[in-house]
């Protein structure tokens, strides 16, 4: 698993719904494949980190003022939707199709 | 200023450019507001931080499992442009209006 | 129970425009999201498209063959979704179902030939 | 050409065990959202299951597995009245909806 001493990565982060309390209202999956965003954003920021200007200022004043100015942050860019069967007020089961933003596509620092 | 302990929010960031080695090709402004994203992302996570559903659900699985995975991280979501003056290849000043994703418009906990 | 009941279906002429109803009940409807799906003669299924809950932002996407020509709305207060479709062209022949994923109408035939 | 590959046709005698595939032919479809269609003759399609998820209704004679990319839909105990198309669906990021295969025309013979 990407610790803080590896490089920005997407990693296995597998959520069960019960275990956040969404068991409530969402029937079907049980589980799914959120991933997570992990490890640092090192001096220099590579290309598929895809960094912003912003990202790559922060770093050069990071590496001048490490204790002034904190890293950029691993964080999902882009990411996927999922399909979600949940009840609704009466109980019913009702399918959506493409549930935004569930699981993580790509990461990068931000 | 914004520390561990609180919240996720924007707070002020001074760039000299020549601490950053960019004023050997931007010849002003000499310095720039470019603000950085500090603070927790914690539960429950306001409206104000406009946290994705995958920050949401990454927030509560921290909770339950703070040791195994991370909490979303403060960064910016929203990046304005700054004006430069800089030395084209040839080393003639250019003005560049719209310098994109130089400075943080907001923050937020992706 | 879960009914979904469509109408408005019938032979219309190439370029012409229909609109379809879909009638719900026994489900919070104002909580679905609804789509269309159609299935023309001897063939398969094909998702048109769908419109969010409006606490899910009200939005609605499309499939590219029908792109621009059909619009699909509902009225929460009358539990009815509603596909308009426009510029008609004989490939759009087929039956038409309004569906939450889970629970399908019976379906509405729309043929369009001259 | 339908991203989702079903064989068109499928037979067996009555108790017999029928498996239907579908593959994944386009990245933008991840395996994970796969779930299954019965259309009866004359009727409109109904969901078989989703997920762990099976409607009530449905027997538990059909059940699913996916692997790698592949899905597949399995009958036991085959019997006269499962005759029809049986359709896999799942979801199409880049469309931001369902896409469904081909469907499998199902034959019990005898």
């Known amino acids: 698993s990407a610790g803080a001493g590896s490089h920005c990565q997407k990693t296995s982060l597998r959520v069960n719904f019960e275990d956040i309390g969404w068991d409530s209202w969402i029937i079907a999956p049980k589980e799914y494949e959120a991933y997570e965003c992990k490890g640092g954003c090192f001096f220099p920021l590579a290309d598929d980190v895809t960094p912003t200007k912003h990202a790559i200022v922060q770093t050069l004043v990071h590496l001048k003022f490490p204790t002034k100015v904190g890293k950029a942050c691993c964080v999902p860019t882009k990411l996927s939707p999922i399909s979600v069967l949940y009840k609704d007020d009466m109980g019913v089961p009702t399918l959506k199709y493409h549930y935004e933003g569930m699981s993580v596509a790509e990461c990068g620092c931000r | 200023s914004a520390g561990a302990g609180s919240h996720c929010q924007k707070t002020s960031l001074r760039v000299n450019f020549e601490d950053i080695g960019w004023d050997s090709w931007i010849i002003a402004p000499k310095e720039y507001e470019a603000y950085e994203c500090k603070g927790g992302c914690f539960f429950p996570l306001a409206d104000d931080v406009t946290p994705t559903k995958h920050a949401i659900v990454q927030t509560l699985v921290h909770l339950k499992f703070p040791t195994k995975v991370g909490k979303a991280c403060c960064v910016p979501t929203k990046l304005s442009p700054i004006s430069v003056l800089y030395k084209d290849d040839m080393g003639v000043p250019t003005l560049k209006y719209h310098y994109e994703g130089m400075s943080v418009a907001e923050c937020g906990c992706r | 129970e879960v009914q979904l009941v469509e109408s408005g279906g019938g032979l219309v002429k190439p370029g012409g425009s229909l609109r379809l109803s879909c009638a719900a009940s026994?489900?919070?409807?104002?909580?679905?999201?609804m789509s269309w799906v159609r299935q023309a003669p001897g063939k398969g299924l094909e998702w048109v498209g769908r419109i969010k809950s409006k606490t899910d932002s009200g939005t609605t996407d499309y499939a590219a063959p029908v792109e621009g020509r059909f619009t699909i709305s509902r009225d929460d207060s009358k539990n009815t979704l509603y596909l308009q479709m426009n510029s008609l062209k004989t490939e759009d022949t087929a039956v038409y179902y309004c569906?939450?994923?889970?629970?399908w109408g019976q379906g509405t035939l729309v043929t369009v030939s001259s | 050409q339908s991203v989702l590959t079903q064989p068109p046709s499928a037979s067996g005698t009555p108790g017999q065990r029928v498996t239907i595939s579908c593959s994944v032919t386009?990245?933008?479809?991840?395996?994970?959202?796969v779930h299954w269609y019965q259309q009866l003759p004359g009727t409109a399609p109904k969901l078989l299951f989703f997920h762990e998820y099976r409607p009530s209704g449905v027997s538990d004679r059909f059940s699913g597995s996916k692997s790698g990319t592949s899905a597949s839909l399995a009958i036991v105990g085959l019997q006269s009245e499962d005759e029809g198309y049986y359709y896999c669906?799942?979801?199409?990021?880049?469309?931001?909806?369902?896409?469904f295969g081909g469907g499998t025309k199902l034959t019990v013979l005898g």
């Open positions: 669906a799942g979801l199409d990021e880049a469309m931001r909806g369902p896409v």
């Open positions: 569906t939450t994923g889970t629970y």
């Open positions: 386009n990245p933008d479809i991840d395996i994970f959202n």
């Open positions: 026994g489900f919070t409807f104002s909580n679905a999201w």
